[in-house]
């Protein structure tokens, strides 16, 4: 089975992930290739091989260890164990099973400091499944009147997903119809004329644009949705940058 990982290369690649540095240039650990770490959520069919990578540098060369759900990950914790390729900063698990689901954290340390990065593994049984959305997306946003804003929804679906961006609206001063269902306006949906449906861009916003924006994703199995709030501030008030929150779990199904 194909390797499922943040990069498509195997461990014979020539990228210089293993960095040796001059002793006089001592340095705490740092990531050398964050692009290979961007994909935090790995939804993988059972029986596939999974590879997580945390390419790092530092002086002296840091050590790497792996945690599963915050605890030391031992070989005996899974049938067949796992491989760690230190020179490629990787963890490899072959033929994953549902009990492999969880958060995998690489801990990279030397005497000057430590850094860590967490991946979430979801093992999908070999049957069709509903869409999965990356947690924390779309993220809450704020901007001033006249500003631009972008919401992003990261979707994993091995069946064709239909993506909709929806906003709650009012009709005759009411948010709900006679059937008790909310009034909704579809702002964008995936289709022939819609490019990059995972992104909703709003330009020159007004106070009327404030509110909740829902990313709703459907395939023939089911649906998933997550929402974010847009705060529109008066022109003289600068937006406050929201602190980045690491949500757990990393997906919604």
């Amino acid at each position: 089975d194909a390797i499922s990982s943040g990069d498509d290369e195997d461990d014979t690649d020539s990228s210089e992930d293993f960095v040796s540095e001059n002793r006089s240039n001592q340095r705490a650990p740092y990531w050398t290739n964050t692009e290979k770490m961007e994909k935090r959520l790995h939804a993988v069919p059972a029986a596939n091989t999974v590879k997580f990578r945390c390419p790092a540098g530092g002086n002296p060369t840091p050590t790497m260890r792996w945690l599963k759900n915050g605890k030391e990950f031992k070989q005996e914790h899974r049938i067949g164990g796992y491989k760690v390729r230190n020179q490629h900063w990787s963890l490899i698990m072959e033929s994953v099973v549902p009990s492999d689901k969880g958060n995998y954290t690489c801990l990279v340390e030397n005497e000057y400091g430590s850094i860590n990065h967490t991946y979430h593994l979801d093992v999908v049984e070999r049957s069709p499944h509903r869409p999965i959305l990356q947690a924390g997306l779309p993220a809450n946003a704020s901007t001033v009147v006249g500003g631009d804003v972008e919401f992003v929804c990261k979707v994993y679906s091995d069946a064709q997903p239909h993506i909709q961006w929806i906003k709650h609206v009012e009709k005759n001063g009411s948010k709900y119809g006679p059937d008790g269902l909310p009034y909704l306006k579809v702002l964008k949906h995936s289709g022939i004329n819609s490019s990059n449906a995972e992104v909703l861009a709003l330009f020159n916003v007004t106070e009327m644009d404030a509110g909740e924006y829902i990313c709703k994703v459907s395939n023939y199995i089911g649906q998933a949705n997550q929402s974010a709030w847009l705060t529109v501030l008066p022109k003289q008030q600068a937006p406050v940058r929201e602190k980045e929150i690491t949500a757990s779990p990393d997906y919604l199904e």
């Epitope: 069709p128 091995d158 269902l181 459907s218 023939y220 199995i221 649906q223």
Partner: antibody
């Protein structure tokens, strides 16, 4: 164990309506589309529409729009398909199907004067 | 609506034979599903998302293809495989099925 159990066979006259039920068990009924597919005698399969029980989202095959009504009762995990203004060519086995791989046993609807 | 055309419409083969059924779509698709149906029974899912074997389906069944051309292959026919096979697309509304391929004993 996932099961979809459909109501029994029906015989109807042209112009009448029929309502077929599909009771789901063994999974979270609200979290998956319930599709309806029919098969006329000796013919192939035809998708009629689907309902998402959680929020009542519905997608219809335009061929049946105006004649088919899909509903559900989440309290008893049951989906319904009602077909109105029946014609003789509506004689078919009607199936409910969910999660891509689970099907009801089929309900035979015969339209005859 | 996307039309799916299966070929052949019927096929005679013997136990142990390798059999291939094709499904041609009128527009490009990302994925295809395949079902087996026996007389008086509901369809049974064999392959989903073009090449994934459904739970409990023997490994002699396989699916492949992309765009407009998809294939179901049975590597070595068994007596229980004689049935009608349908392709289906779940990508675009209205969802559609092929007309079916009847696989009979030679």
């Amino acid at each position: 164990e996932v099961q979809l159990v459909q109501s029994g066979a029906e015989v109807k006259k042209p112009g009448a309506s029929v309502k077929v039920s599909c009771k789901a068990s063994g999974y979270t009924f609200t979290n998956y589309w319930m599709h309806w597919v029919r098969q006329a005698p000796g013919q192939g399969l035809e998708w009629m529409g689907a309902i998402y029980p959680e929020n009542r989202d519905i997608n219809y095959n335009q061929k049946f729009k105006g004649r088919v009504t899909l509903t559900r009762d989440t309290s008893i995990s049951t989906a319904y398909m009602e077909l109105s203004r029946l014609r003789s060519d509506d004689t078919a086995v009607y199936y409910c199907t969910s999660r891509g791989d689970y099907w009801g046993q089929g309900t035979t609807v015969t339209v005859s004067s | 609506a996307i039309q799916l055309t299966q070929s052949p419409s019927s096929l005679s083969a013997s136990v142990g034979d390798r059999v291939t059924i094709t499904c041609s779509a009128s527009s490009g698709l990302s994925y295809m599903s395949w079902y087996q149906q026996k007389p008086g029974k509901a369809p049974k899912l064999l392959i989903y998302d073009t090449s994934n074997l459904a739970s409990g389906v023997p490994s002699r069944f396989s699916g492949s293809g992309s765009g407009t051309d998809f294939t179901l292959t049975i590597s070595s026919l068994q007596p229980e495989d004689f049935a009608t096979y349908y392709c289906q697309q779940w990508s675009s509304y209205p969802y559609t099925f092929g007309q079916g391929t009847k696989l009979e004993i030679k």
